[in-house]
């Protein structure tokens, strides 16, 4: 697994830098939580077609994943700072059991897909305490998501596989705007 | 052949409106972010705006917010560049770019730049 | 807009020189800024990205190196070839440049 956000060497050569702001610690997070995807993403697209295949849509079906737009207050234009960072921590929130399901579909890449995990529930601890209206994410049903898990999990082999591209390939597109707007508040 | 091919530069007077296009062959822009940047005659690069392929997010420089409007057709692997109120100061060669990865973009691919002239 | 400042504007050197260049970010932008190198009557071209990393097939010579808002572009034996104008871009938001340094011979 990569070395954890203020841990890699360049921190360690120059004890003397200032601490990391709230804000460069969720950016160096975000970036943190990318470069463990495009690992996990090398795996899926090396162990199979998926990642050129063009069925997407078939196994899309099945998925409910988050995705920004325009009214979520996040782009340039509307640019909504809290109406953004609640819908950042709700996409957050939903992309949690996506990826529990990612968890055991990875060989060589297991702890890597871990760590992902992890450091989304960090990412999400960040951003709550910089959310002032907390009262305005809603978290997904447990109840709800055990159900999906079950559902992901009995599909096909090549469903599976596909399942797996698709949460990689949205988490990437979610993080990677989520990122853009975080770095206009 | 990975390339950007521009078209759509020209002669129009002050208040005008013109649209730039850039044509992508060898990847496709629907996967990723794709940028303008211009550069007046004898004076440095400007950056105009990029556009994020993920939900065609747009970003602009605040020198043209308002009036220029960047877009794509993914069909046609087309970015375009629509400049309304035209002015002077918007003279020089309009670079169409691809940003080359995804949370610490530089711009690894160019295309050959096409002229507007904003006069009257 | 996050403003990139380069300096200096204009560097007279000779071939064989050492030579830098410096560029300042009006906000902190981590290490996301490339260096550019551009001749006349041609698209630029990037030499250095994420503050430090040397682009593919670019010499040595070149280096970079800053984080933050403090960068710097260095060449450690100038080339004829070297005889250019460089741009400083940021990426954190947008994509800004600096005003460029043409540098030219002595």
């Known amino acids: 697994a990569p070395v954890p956000p203020g841990e890699d060497s360049k921190d360690v050569a120059a004890p003397h830098r200032q601490p990391l702001t709230s804000s460069e610690r969720i950016d160096k997070q975000i970036r943190y939580i990318l470069d463990g995807i495009s690992a996990l993403r090398k795996e899926t697209c090396n162990k199979s077609n998926m990642c050129e295949s063009s069925k997407e849509a078939l196994a899309e079906n099945n998925l409910n994943l988050p995705k920004m737009a325009e009214k979520d207050g996040c782009f340039q234009s509307g640019f909504n700072e809290e109406t953004c960072l609640v819908k950042i921590i709700t996409g957050l929130l939903e992309f949690e059991v996506y990826l529990e399901y990612l968890q055991n579909r990875f060989e060589s890449s297991e702890e890597q897909a871990r760590a992902v995990q992890m450091s989304t529930k960090v990412l999400i601890q960040f951003l709550q305490k910089k959310a002032k209206n907390l009262d305005a994410i809603t978290t997904p049903d447990p109840t709800t998501n055990a159900s999906l898990l079950t559902k992901l999990q009995a599909q096909n082999q090549w469903l599976q596989d596909m399942t797996t591209h698709l949460i990689l390939r949205s988490f990437k597109e979610f993080l990677q705007s989520s990122l853009r707007a975080l770095r206009q508040m | 052949e990975v390339q950007l091919v521009q078209s759509g530069g020209g002669l129009i007077q002050p208040g005008g409106s013109l649209r730039l296009s850039c044509a992508a062959s060898?990847?496709?822009?629907?996967?990723?972010?794709m940028i303008w940047v211009r550069q007046a005659p004898g004076k440095g690069l400007e950056w105009v705006s990029d556009l994020y392929y993920y939900a065609g997010d747009t970003y602009y420089a605040d020198s043209v917010k308002g009036r220029f409007t960047m877009s794509r057709d993914i069909s046609k692997n087309t970015v375009y560049l629509q400049m309304n109120s035209l002015r002077a100061e918007d003279t020089g060669v309009y670079y169409c770019?691809?940003?080359?990865?995804?949370?610490?973009?530089?711009?690894?691919?160019w295309g050959r730049g096409t002229l507007v002239t904003v006069s009257s | 807009d996050i403003v990139m400042t380069q300096s200096p504007s204009t560097l007279s050197a000779s071939v064989g020189d050492r030579v830098t260049i410096t560029c300042r970010a009006s906000q902190g932008i981590s290490s996301w800024l490339a260096w550019y190198q551009q001749k006349p009557g041609r698209a630029p071209k990037v030499l250095i990205y994420?503050?430090?990393t040397l682009e593919s097939g670019v010499p040595s010579r070149f280096s970079g190196s800053g984080s933050g808002t403090d960068f710097t572009l260095t060449i450690s034996s100038l080339q004829p070839e070297d005889f250019a104008t460089y741009y400083c871009?940021?990426?954190?938001?947008?994509?800004?440049f600096g005003q460029g340094t043409k540098l030219e011979i002595k």
């Open positions: 770019a691809r940003w080359a990865d995804d949370h610490a973009p530089w711009v690894d691919l």
């Open positions: 060898g990847f496709t822009i629907s996967s990723n972010y």
């Open positions: 871009q940021q990426s954190w938001l947008g994509g800004s």
């Open positions: 994420k503050a430090s």
